[in-house]
């Protein structure tokens, strides 16, 4: 047989589907590996072949498309399960070939069990919404292509285990769920159950989105340095340990990169000869505002160390801040002037 371009196991596509629900899985070749689509491939005489390896087995076997009620079928570049079973879990391969060309990729499919409250090992997408913002809508995800537009499915929304009926600021509107002036108490898992008919059978699709209410852009600020500050003087004798915390508050900003760093006499700690240890810790508020603390410590401080300029710096997408620590030698009577 001719050589086949084997793209291996595409672990980026860790597909999870619920047991006893329909699942449509597109062959990843056309989405991520090849420059042309299925229609082009098909019209140039290429055939798409599916096979699989069961969980905990090494043997590749063809997929049985002759099951009762066409439980598993293929339509163009889509593999259909109507519905899935737990033992459908495994690695699936789609191969595009003719007599002169071959390309294939495998991907893992996990069929997941859920309980009556939709608890499962499924990984849910996270939707971040701004606190107090007017209206946020979430849409029941990944239901496109399961039924034609002429079919009007019934949709029921749940928060956790509770059907959303008469929630004061959460309104189900078909495939959409609207949040009015969201608060942190709106955090949680929201599940839509879509029920649609097909060939005299009713199918259910269960989709869950994790809602996380975060700080509003209107409250976004440059970093605020709580410590060091002008009120605290770090007064030490040579030989003592010097510990200076740099504590910085960052308001939540979507996709912001928050940075905190120290400079000693204008240089990064790695570029000075002083034996410095820096430990960092991070904590988050209920709206994902961040407090980042970097503790600078010198085990046995020297008189020279006590004359150095220690500056805490912070940066986010809104701006930068810096604050010098007031360090002096005990009994010296004067604080070294800080030049920023």
């Amino acid at each position: 047989s001719e050589r086949c371009d084997d793209w291996g196991l595409d672990t980026m596509r860790q597909i999870q589907v619920f047991e006893d629900e329909p699942a449509r899985i597109k062959c990843p070749l056309f989405e991520h590996f090849l420059k042309y689509n299925y229609s082009t491939a098909h019209s140039s005489g290429l055939t798409l072949i599916w096979y699989w390896t069961r969980q905990d087995r090494d043997l590749e076997e063809p997929i049985n498309f002759r099951l009762p009620e066409n439980r598993i079928s293929k339509e163009k570049d889509v593999l259909w399960f109507r519905p899935t079973l737990l033992n459908d879990t495994g690695n699936y391969t789609c191969m595009l070939r003719n007599t002169t060309y071959c390309s294939k990729v495998a991907f893992p499919l996990e069929v997941v069990q859920k309980d009556s409250c939709f608890n499962s090992a499924m990984r849910f997408p996270v939707h971040k919404m701004y606190i107090e913002h007017g209206i946020h809508k979430i849409t029941c995800p990944n239901v496109d292509g399961y039924f034609p537009s002429s079919v009007k499915p019934s949709v029921t929304w749940y928060k956790g285990c509770t059907e959303i009926v008469d929630f004061h600021n959460v309104l189900p509107e078909g495939m959409n769920l609207s949040f009015f002036i969201p608060l942190v108490s709106n955090n949680g898992n929201y599940t839509c159950v879509v029920t649609y008919p097909e060939n005299g059978r009713l199918f259910h699709l269960t989709r869950t989105v994790t809602v996380k209410v975060v700080g509003s852009p209107k409250d976004a600020l440059p970093p605020q340095i709580y410590s060091p500050n002008d009120r605290v003087v770090y007064e030490k004798e040579p030989g003592e340990e010097l510990v200076i915390p740099c504590k910085v508050y960052f308001s939540f900003i979507m996709d912001s990169h928050n940075e905190v760093w120290w400079t000693i006499d204008g240089k990064k700690p790695d570029d000075v000869t002083v034996d410095i240890t820096i430990n960092e810790s991070v904590s988050y508020s209920s709206t994902e505002d961040e407090t980042r603390t970097q503790i600078l410590s010198i085990k046995k401080v020297t008189p020279e160390d006590l004359r150095r300029n220690y500056v805490c710096h912070a940066r986010n997408t809104k701006g930068e801040a810096e604050q010098a620590a007031k360090v002096k030698q005990k009994g010296n009577g004067c604080t070294e002037p800080m030049t920023l």
Partner: antibody
Framework: EVQLLESGGGLVQPGGSLRLSCAAS????????MSWVRQAPGKGLEWVSA????????LYADSVKGRFTISRDNSKNTLYLQMNSLRAEDTAVYYC???????????WGQGTLVTVSS | EIVMTQSPATLSVSPGERATLSCRAS??????LAWYQQKPGQAPRLLIY???TRATGIPARFSGSGSGTEFTLTISSLQSEDFAVYYC?????????FGQGTKVEIK
Amino acid sequence: EVQLLESGGGLVQPGGSLRLSCAASGFTLSGFSMSWVRQAPGKGLEWVSAISYDGEGTLYADSVKGRFTISRDNSKNTLYLQMNSLRAEDTAVYYCARFRYYTAFDYWGQGTLVTVSS
Amino acid sequence: EIVMTQSPATLSVSPGERATLSCRASQSVSSNLAWYQQKPGQAPRLLIYGASTRATGIPARFSGSGSGTEFTLTISSLQSEDFAVYYCQQYNNWPWTFGQGTKVEIK
């Protein structure tokens, strides 16, 4: 100094309408969500309605839903409450209040009295 | 909706004494609870938010505690200007709801 000043209260017959205004000064209204809270004579406080800082999201107490409409004009730094189909039980002092999730109702107006009576 | 219940309805205290006011929520409101003071003919004034943080300009004799469903407002040494009605309010869930109030009067 933050100030909220309500106006538009008065005597109105049952079934009638009234529009309350709340003029804000000392801060930019567009940066804050706002609410109306009322207090019937000799009674406690009751939240009536809220509007988000961008004006898109509104919420109402069940007792006024479908009859009252909250709105805002950020360019005029003013909050409004349109009250229709008024009932005797709507008689109260109406306060506008600034709110943030972090600090609740941090500033209140002095209130305007609405009396619904025939 | 979350029902807020305050006790006692009236508290008679002598000036200089300590006053302890209670507020209970019908379900957890985390720390999203505020306390307000209202004097006759005036608007309410924010005293405490986040269950325990004093609002700007509020004297240190006012302190709040609690989380979840049980909350307390303590006035450590009552001054003449502290005799008023005090309301608790939850802002954890819509609709935001108030307690019925506790009147602190001179004994």
